[in-house]
C-alpha cells in the first residue's frame, strides 16, 4: 500500500492576511484565523512530518479584499509560489479582469502548474495562452506518480469575465478523455481538481471513470467528521463517499473557504491505484498555529501599498450620497440606488443575442448601507469612504429565484416597518409599492422587474411562477436580516465580487456620479 | 510546563516485545506530531517513526517497519512505542519527542531497554 | 532520504577558547517560501536527551546563551561557540528539519581540557 497526503484549500479569496473568526478583517490578533503565513506553518510541519504530500488549491484565490483591488493577482503567485503549491484549478474569480488580468499576474508567473480540462481556447487566445494553463498535470510524488486533472464551472461566463475565445465546456464531457489518457500513460492514481460545486464534484465522482479522488471549490461546502471545531455546520462527513457508476468508492472533499481551514486528507491506495481507505479533516487554522514570522514580514511589505491605496481619489460625487439609515431603512435611497447601479453593471455579461443581459434585478438590505458620504469634501470618494458604508467584507452574489419568492422577500421588507430596522429592501431594476395599511404580508399592491429577453428593456409584472436571476448580498442569500425564504427557496447561488470592489470599480469607470431618488419604491393608500 | 513522562528502564529476554509509554501534559495534546528515536550506546540519534495523535496516522523509518508500531491514547494524552522480536541490537535509550512547528520541540527523559538473557 | 554528515567527530579544547563544527547535507534545506534553512543543532549533555540550541540554521533557542552561534546556507552550516565554558561538554547533532524523513548527523563529541 502506498500512502498519499493531500492538503487542499478552495475560494480563498483574497484573504493572504488572518481574518477574524467569520473571515472578515481581523481585530484581535490572539483570536485570528488563517492567512498565508499561519498556513504556511501548518503545511511545512505536515511536510517534514510526512512522506507523500501534495498541496492543491481548488480555485477561486482572487477576488475578495483590498489585496485583489491593488495587486490584481500578483500577490497569489508570489504567496502560492512561496507556499510551494503543486497545482491550482482555475476558478470563475480567476477571470474577473478578464483573460490578461490571469494570463499576466498568475498565470506566466506561477511556478506551479495551473488547470483546466473543460476550458477551451481558440481565435488568437489559443496560441497567446497555450501551456500556460493545462488540462492535466502528472506529478512525482515519492517514488511514484500522481495525475491531477482540472475543471472550471461552465457558468464562469455568466459569472465572471472570461471573453469570446475561451469556451467552457461540460466538466464530465470533458475530464472524461483527459483521465483516459492518463491512463494509457500508466498512471494509476487520478484526482480531479476544480471549482464547480459540490453538487457537479459529486457527479464527476459518480461519472468519470478512472477519478479517484475529488477535491472541489466554489460552493464552500464544509465537511467534518466528528465535533466541528468553529461556527460552520458540516454539510455532511469528511471526506464525503460517492459510489461510482463502476461500484468505487470515491472521497470527495471541499475545505470551506477564506483560508481559515487547510483541508486533510490521508488517501492509501493499492499497487494498482485503487483507493483502500481515506480518512481526515479539515484543520482549523487559528491562532494556536504561529504565523511564520518571515512570511509574515513579507506580508506586512506587501500591506504598505494597501494603505496608500485606501486614501486614494477613485472618483467624485457631485450630490450627497445618502447612507443614512433614517432614509435607507425607510425608503428609497440614492446610496441604494448607487450600490444597486453598480452590482447591476459589474455583472453585465452579454452571452446571448435574445438577451440585453442575463440578469436586471438587485436587491439590497438596507441595514447594510452604513454611512453616508458627503460630496462637500471636494466629492471625492476614497475606498476608505466606501469601507465606512460597506464595512462587513461581504460579496454581492448572483441567485436564481421563483417570482414567488422574490414576493415573499419584499414583503418581509415591510412586514414591520417603522422600526428602523435592516431588512427594507433597496432595489436595482425593480418598482414595487407598498400599501402599509394593509396587514403585514399583504402589503406589496405592485412589483414590476424590468425585462432580460428583450431588446429594449422595460418594466413587467412579476410572474410567480417565473425563475428570475437576482443580484444581492450574500448576507441575503444565507437568510439574514431574516430573509429565510431566500436561503430556503433559492434554486442556484454563486458567489460574486466583494462588495467595496464592485461599488469602486463603478464609480472609477463613471468617473462623476449622481445618483438620484427616482420612484424606484413607492408608497400608496387605498386601491390601485 | 510541557512534561514528557516516560516509563521506567526495560530488561527483557530476546525474542519478547516491549512497549514503553510517553505520557504528555502541559499542551494541547493533538496539536502536534510525536515522534520517537533510537540511540544505542555512544551512538547517534535514529528517528524511528512518528504518529499523528488526532488520527493515529503513523509514518515509519523504513528500517524499523515490522520492528516498532506506535499508538496514542488521546483520553489519557499517551504515546507508546512497542517492539518486537526484540535483539540485543535493539538494546538502546529510546525517546519520545513532538515536534512543534519548527523542530523537535521536548523531549521525554529516555527509557533505557536492554535485551539480554 | 537527506543524508547528514558532521565533523569532526570529536574535538577537545581548552575553556574560553572559540570551537567551530560542521554540518552538510546531501540536499539544499534552505525553503524557498520563507528563505529559512531548516536546519536544527542540538546540545546532549551526558545522561540527558538532546536540548535544541539552534533552529532555522541561525536562530538561537530562547535562553541559549549567545555564545552560541549558527550559521551556513543550502547544505553547508556551521555550529561557533565563541568561548567554550566547562558546562559546554557534550555531544552537538544537526538535524534536517526541512523534510521528511527527519535525519541526524553522527554527532561532534566536545571534550574540555
Known amino acids: 500500500a502506498w500512502e498519499l497526503t493531500i492538503l487542499h484549500t478552495n475560494d480563498v479569496h483574497s484573504r493572504l492576511e488572518q481574518t477574524s473568526e467569520d473571515s472578515s478583517k481581523c481585530v484581535n490578533a490572539s483570536r485570528c484565523m488563517g492567512g498565508v503565513a499561519r498556513l504556511f506553518t501548518k503545511v511545512q510541519q505536515i511536510r517534514r512530518a510526512e512522506p507523500n504530500v501534495l498541496l492543491l488549491d481548488a480555485g477561486d484565490q482572487y477576488q475578495g479584499t483590498i489585496w485583489f483591488t491593488v495587486y490584481k493577482g500578483a500577490e497569489v503567485a508570489h504567496f502560492m509560489n512561496a507556499l510551494r503549491y503543486d497545482a491550482m484549478a482555475l476558478g470563475n474569480h480567476e477571470f474577473d479582469n478578464g483573460v490578461e488580468g490571469l494570463i499576466e499576474p498568475l498565470l506566466k508567473e506561477a511556478k506551479f502548474p495551473i488547470l483546466s480540462a473543460n476550458i477551451k481556447a481558440k481565435g488568437p487566445l489559443a496560441s497567446q495562452i497555450s501551456g500556460l494553463y493545462l488540462p492535466y498535470k502528472v506529478l512525482p510524488v515519492g517514488d511514484e506518480v500522481v495525475g491531477i486533472v482540472g475543471y472550471t464551472s461552465k457558468e464562469t461566463p455568466f459569472l465572471s469575465n472570461p471573453g469570446t475565445n475561451l469556451v467552457f465546456e461540460d466538466e464530465i464531457t470533458a475530464l472524461q478523455p483527459e483521465v483516459d489518457k492518463l491512463k494509457t500513460l500508466n498512471v494509476n492514481k487520478i484526482i480531479a481538481l476544480g471549482h464547480s460545486g459540490f453538487e457537479m464534484d459529486k457527479l464527476i465522482a459518480q461519472k468519470v471513470r478512472g477519478v479517484d479522488v475529488v477535491v472541489g471549490g466554489h460552493s464552500n461546502t464544509f465537511l467534518y467528521t466528528g465535533n466541528p471545531p468553529s461556527k460552520e455546520v458540516p454539510a455532511g462527513k469528511y471526506p464525503f463517499i460517492v459510489t461510482s457508476d463502476d461500484g468505487r468508492k470515491v472521497p470527495v472533499v471541499q475545505a470551506y473557504a477564506f483560508g481559515k481551514y487547510l483541508g486533510y486528507l490521508k488517501i492509501e491506495f493499492d499497487e494498482r491505484g485503487n483507493v483502500i481507505s481515506s480518512h481526515g479533516n479539515p484543520i482549523l487554522l487559528n491562532s494556536s498555529i504561529p504565523e511564520d514570522p518571515s512570511i509574515k514580514a513579507d506580508i506586512n511589505k506587501w500591506r504598505i501599498k494597501l494603505d496608500n491605496y485606501s486614501t486614494q481619489e477613485l472618483g467624485k460625487t457631485i450630490v450627497y450620497l445618502d447612507g443614512s439609515s433614517q432614509s435607507c431603512r425607510f425608503r428609497e435611497c440614492n446610496m441604494g440606488n448607487l450600490i444597486c447601479d453598480a452590482m447591476i453593471n459589474n455583472n453585465l455579461r452579454h452571452t446571448d443575442e435574445m438577451f440585453w443581459n442575463h440578469v436586471s434585478m438587485c436587491i439590497l438590505n438596507g441595514g447594510g448601507i452604513r454611512s453616508p458620504i458627503d460630496e462637500r469634501n471636494n466629492g471625492t470618494i476614497t475606498w476608505e469612504n466606501l469601507a465606512a458604508v460597506l464595512p462587513f467584507g461581504g460579496t454581492f452574489d448572483l441567485v436564481q429565484l421563483k417570482g414567488s419568492t422574490l414576493k415573499k422577500a419584499f414583503e418581509h421588507s415591510v412586514h414591520r416597518y417603522g422600526q428602523s430596522t435592516g431588512e427594507f429592501l433597496q432595489v436595482g431594476g425593480i418598482h414595487v409599492v407598498y400599501d402599509l395599511s394593509r396587514k403585514p404580508g399583504d402589503r406589496v399592491v405592485k412589483l414590476d422587474v424590468l425585462c432580460t429577453k428583450c431588446r429594449v428593456p422595460s418594466y413587467d409584472p412579476l410572474k410567480m411562477d417565473e425563475v428570475y436571476k437576482v443580484i444581492l448580498p450574500n448576507f441575503l442569500a444565507n437568510g439574514g436580516d431574516g430573509f429565510q425564504m431566500i436561503k430556503d427557496e433559492l434554486l442556484r447561488h454563486d458567489s460574486g465580487d466583494q462588495d467595496i470592489n464592485v461599488v469602486s470599480t463603478y464609480i472609477s469607470k463613471m468617473k462623476v456620479i449622481y445618483p438620484a431618488v427616482e420612484g424606484r419604491i413607492k408608497f400608496s393608500t387605498g386601491s390601485h | 510546563e510541557v512534561q514528557l513522562q516516560q516509563s521506567g528502564p526495560e530488561l527483557v529476554k530476546p525474542g519478547a516485545s516491549v512497549k514503553i509509554s510517553c505520557k504528555a501534559s502541559?499542551?494541547?495534546?493533538?496539536?502536534?506530531?510525536m515522534n520517537w528515536v533510537k540511540q544505542s550506546h555512544g551512538k547517534s540519534l535514529e528517528w524511528i517513526g512518528n504518529?499523528?495523535?488526532?488520527?493515529?496516522?503513523?509514518n515509519y523509518n523504513q528500517k524499523f517497519k515490522g520492528k516498532a508500531t506506535l499508538t496514542v491514547d488521546k483520553s489519557s494524552s499517551t504515546a507508546s512505542m512497542e517492539l518486537r522480536s526484540l535483539t540485543s541490537e535493539d538494546s538502546a535509550v529510546y525517546y519520545c519527542?513532538?515536534?512543534?512547528?519548527?523542530?523537535?520541540?521536548?523531549w521525554g527523559q529516555g527509557t533505557t531497554l536492554t535485551v539480554s538473557s | 532520504d537527506i543524508v547528514m554528515t558532521q565533523s569532526p567527530s570529536s574535538l577537545t579544547v581548552t575553556a574560553g577558547e572559540k570551537v567551530t563544527m560542521s554540518c552538510k547535507s546531501s540536499?539544499?534545506?534552505?525553503?524557498?517560501?520563507?528563505?529559512?534553512?531548516?536546519l536544527t543543532w542540538y546540545q546532549q549533555k551526558p545522561g540527558q536527551p538532546p536540548k535544541v540550541l539552534i533552529y532555522?540554521?541561525?536562530t538561537r533557542e530562547s535562553g541559549v546563551p549567545d555564545r552560541f552561534t549558527g550559521s551556513g546556507s543550502g547544505t553547508d552550516f556551521t555550529l561557533t561557540i565563541s568561548s567554550v565554558q566547562a558546562e559546554d561538554l557534550a555531544v552537538y547533532y544537526c538535524?534536517?528539519?526541512?523534510?521528511?524523513?527527519?535525519?541526524f548527523g553522527g554527532g561532534t563529541n566536545l571534550e574540555i581540557k
Open positions: 538535524q534536517n528539519d526541512y523534510s521528511y524523513p527527519p535525519t
Open positions: 532555522w540554521a541561525s
Open positions: 504518529i499523528n495523535p488526532n488520527n493515529g496516522d503513523t
Open positions: 519527542a513532538n515536534s512543534g512547528y519548527y523542530y523537535f520541540d521536548y
Open positions: 502541559g499542551y494541547t495534546f493533538t496539536d502536534y506530531y
Open positions: 540536499q539544499s534545506l534552505l525553503n524557498s517560501g520563507n528563505q529559512k534553512n531548516y
